[in-house]
Interface confidence: medium
Amino acid sequence: AVDLTLLANLRLTDPQRFFLTCVSGEAGAGRGSDAWGPPLLLEKDDRIVRTPPGPPLRLARNGSHQVTLRGFSKPSDLVGVFSCVGGAGARRTRVIYVHNSPGAHLLPDKVTHTVNKGDTAVLSARVHKEKQTDVIWKSNGSYFYTLDWHEAQDGRFLLQLPNVQPPSSGIYSATYLEASPLGSAFFRLIVRGCGAGRWGPGCTKECPGCLHGGVCHDHDGECVCPPGFTGTRCEQACREGRFGQSCQEQCPGISGCRGLTFCLPDPYGCSCGSGWRGSQCQEACAPGHFGADCRLQCQCQNGGTCDRFSGCVCPSGWHGVHCEKSDRIPQILNMASELEFNLETMPRINCAAAGNPFPVRGSIELRKPDGTVLLSTKAIVEPEKTTAEFEVPRLVLADSGFWECRVSTSGGQDSRRFKVNVKVPPVPLAAPRLLTKQSRQLVVSPLVSFSGDGPISTVRLHYRPQDSTMDWSTIVVDPSENVTLMNLRPKTGYSVRVQLSRPGEGGEGAWGPPTLMTTDCPEPLLQPWLEGWHVEGTDRLRVSWSLPLVPGPLVGDGFLLRLWDGTRGQERRENVSSPQARTALLTGLTPGTHYQLDVQLYHCTLLGPASPPAHVLLPPSGPPAPRHLHAQALSDSEIQLTWKHPEALPGPISKYVVEVQVAGGAGDPLWIDVDRPEETSTIIRGLNASTRYLFRMRASIQGLGDWSNTVEESTLGNGLQAEGPVQESRAAEEGLDQ
């Protein structure tokens, strides 16, 4: 199971002092910045138990293995479900803590209930403040059952769940019908996926017999040990105030683990620390009791004394859980509870034993999970013990599981089971990723998904030119950092592969798939300069430039023109894709804008030095369109146009421009200037008879303005073909019939 503990500080006089801490004992836990260790997540889960919104809770990371949640401002903030998520990949695990309000109407006799598939679970809610209304039981927030208030038994409302199955797991609550949901009793039901003492996909495998209240995990058969116990079967007590799978963590504060609730991965759930009990874990165990929640009884024999943290402390000459075994009986010593080896390695395993008579080499054997017995190849005999060494044949995945070291003498026998984890060296599933490239170097991210097991201890990057038969170059890198491959050849393809290793002998995995990474072209070195520019309209600019003359071919694919509008903080880039080009027309610019302009040569994706900048001011845009344009045929060759001046003029109009075009005609339109800006009427002459024309016009101040609406009109009668339109204008007189 993942070494993940959620600690709740239950000293509840002041909610502001309340905190939750999630502690991970996993290698690489919580680093979060790399692919091997996703971050520890600690949060309130509002999906089932919703509380009134308050100020956001504060999350503080203390190193890579610990995260703490604080900032609770009122008691109602505490009520509900909290979860911590840790571990990587398939080992990602969620630990859940359920907090009840000490002032609730109903209180759970026991918050966490872990039961086996097919068992009957009984949830008991104790009446703390009576109400004479129905009691509603909910499962995961949905209605489940109703009890009448008269149905309380000895001041408790019971919910009996016969033949429970894994889908029955979840958060249960008991609430008086008209009370606030925050006054509910909240429970957590964990249903193991197998019957008692079994684990595995078909529940065919036998659990190791977890001691001291440990719970057998239904997926992997490991014991999830209560806080304060360690070992494959939780056989070993930690020193007082310590917890974690290897007793590596220390309870905070001077009073040790008092007042702390410990939540561990399912199927364990939550309990007080070893030596403590009560709803707030502040009561020491009664004499004769020990362990988490004081659930264990010592029953020490042969003069052993009961320690509330560790159980029986045996006098000299005795050992065993109840001091029931004489020291004359042989005893396996200091056997690691868990060993890890890499696939296809041939490790040596040592097993030490003592006793009277003294164990010899032949009296110690090693049994594999498949029942195969290994005999030791050599033994080291010391005054107080014999250590047998076993040479293990090449390991296969099926060797994962519980191994057993057994010692037999005429004084009796002892055995110790230990877990062997056969790990698969990691193999990259993908090629490394190119981050950036230059002409002589490549920056590569070696972080890739992989098959097999972590943690990753080293990453090797192998590379060589594509289609080359030369030896691979190798660089060893930190798993969390990007790598720069240097001193490469420009414009060259390189084959790049990743090899991952995990700790231990034989931890190197196979090489991952190759990928082709190509170095960039040489950087262009020539600096162009701007020859000149001229404005071709309020939004158009023609630019020309030159390059210095150098011998040899031009290193470049084209030019990049950049226009910087400092007022708006906008940059416009124009790509000229011919290296021979020395001029470009820039259109769609903003009239009346001050631009900074420069040009640079590019080659592939690389830019050369920019030219010295030039400053260009485009003329402002022209005035608004003339209004109410109207056309009226006067004869077979004349049409009169009338209009009104544009509104909101930025300055005096210098002229009007009329556009004349034959309707449906394919030719270019004709533009005619009206040079007397005070005019509001003009006659267009020299038109063809019986011909439909389109007219529109615009005004000019410093630049040409917007076009007016287009009007249509036909010339009259069948006259002679005219030479072409000309105009005559005059001011339209108000009220005069024209």
């Epitope: 927030g141 209605y143 109703t146 009890l147």
Partner: antibody
Framework: EVQLLESGGGLVQPGGSLRLSCAAS???????KMWWVRQAPGKGLEWVS?????????YYADSVKGRFTISRDNSKNTLYLQMNSLRAEDTAVYYC??????????????????WGQGTMVTVSS | DIQMTQSPGTLSLSPGERATLSCRAS???????LAWYQQKPGQAPRLLIY???SRATGIPDRFSGSGSGTDFTLTISRLEPEDLAVYYC??????????FGQGTRLEIK
């Protein structure tokens, strides 16, 4: 399909007895409070009795207390109403109904979400 | 015991009109336990609104409930011919007793 089906109604003389049944289907009967509600001809609705899921608690309207008995058989998904000492004023259509609790984050709501089609009980000499 | 009084006794409106039905409790009650039912001629009642304002499953959105304390309202925004029915309000008490209003008959002109 979630449904309730009443049976057992009929004509009975004053002072006589009758047993109504209500068969439930389409939901977990053993989890819900079940009720009998009646409606005299041309009149409004009147609650008669309620029984809790376990069968351990029952309540009656004052007008039927001591004469009617509500019960349930969770294994058969059936609700019963044993009516003794019947009177003319007990003449009505008798409905069985399920009350379902919905809960939000702040409170729970109770309402009759499923009704049977009703069975007519006529008490007349 | 709390009494529930509905008004008017009968309401006669045309299709498309808005119907407003009132229910008054003799003392302040929790809106969580107030429900409205529709009973069409010859049929069993049907739940429309629970918790004073939440629409039951499958009920058209032209039906809405509101109110708190002692005064509660059922509104039908656009009457349809099939809305012809008797409408009852109902209160779940904190004891198992429940109280129905006497009903409002809705007639469609």
């Amino acid at each position: 399909e979630v449904q309730l089906l009443e049976s057992g109604g009929g004509l009975v003389q004053p002072g006589g007895s009758l047993r109504l049944s209500c068969a439930a289907s389409g939901f977990t009967f053993s989890k819900y409070k079940m009720w009998w509600v009646r409606q005299a001809p041309g009149k409004g609705l009147e609650w008669v009795s309620v029984i809790y899921p376990s069968g351990g608690a029952t309540y009656y309207a004052d007008s039927v207390k001591g004469r009617f008995t509500i019960s349930r058989d969770n294994s058969k998904n059936t609700l019963y109403l044993q009516m003794n000492s019947l009177r003319a004023e007990d003449t009505a259509v008798y409905y069985c109904a399920r009350s379902s609790l919905g809960c939000s984050s702040t409170s729970c709501y109770d309402a009759f979400d499923i009704w049977g089609q009703g069975t007519m009980v006529t008490v007349s000499s | 015991d709390i009494q529930m009084t509905q008004s008017p006794g009968t309401l006669s409106l045309s299709p498309g009109e808005r119907a407003t039905l009132s229910c008054r409790a003799s003392q302040s009650v929790s809106s969580s336990y107030l429900a409205w039912y529709q009973q069409k001629p010859g049929q069993a009642p049907r739940l429309l609104i629970y918790g004073a304002s939440s629409r039951a499953t499958g009920i058209p959105d032209r039906f809405s409930g509101s109110g708190s304390g002692t005064d509660f309202t059922l509104t039908i925004s656009r009457l349809e011919p099939e809305d012809l029915a008797v409408y009852y309000c109902q209160l779940f008490g904190s004891s198992p007793r429940i109280t129905f209003g006497q009903g409002t008959r809705l007639e469609i002109k």
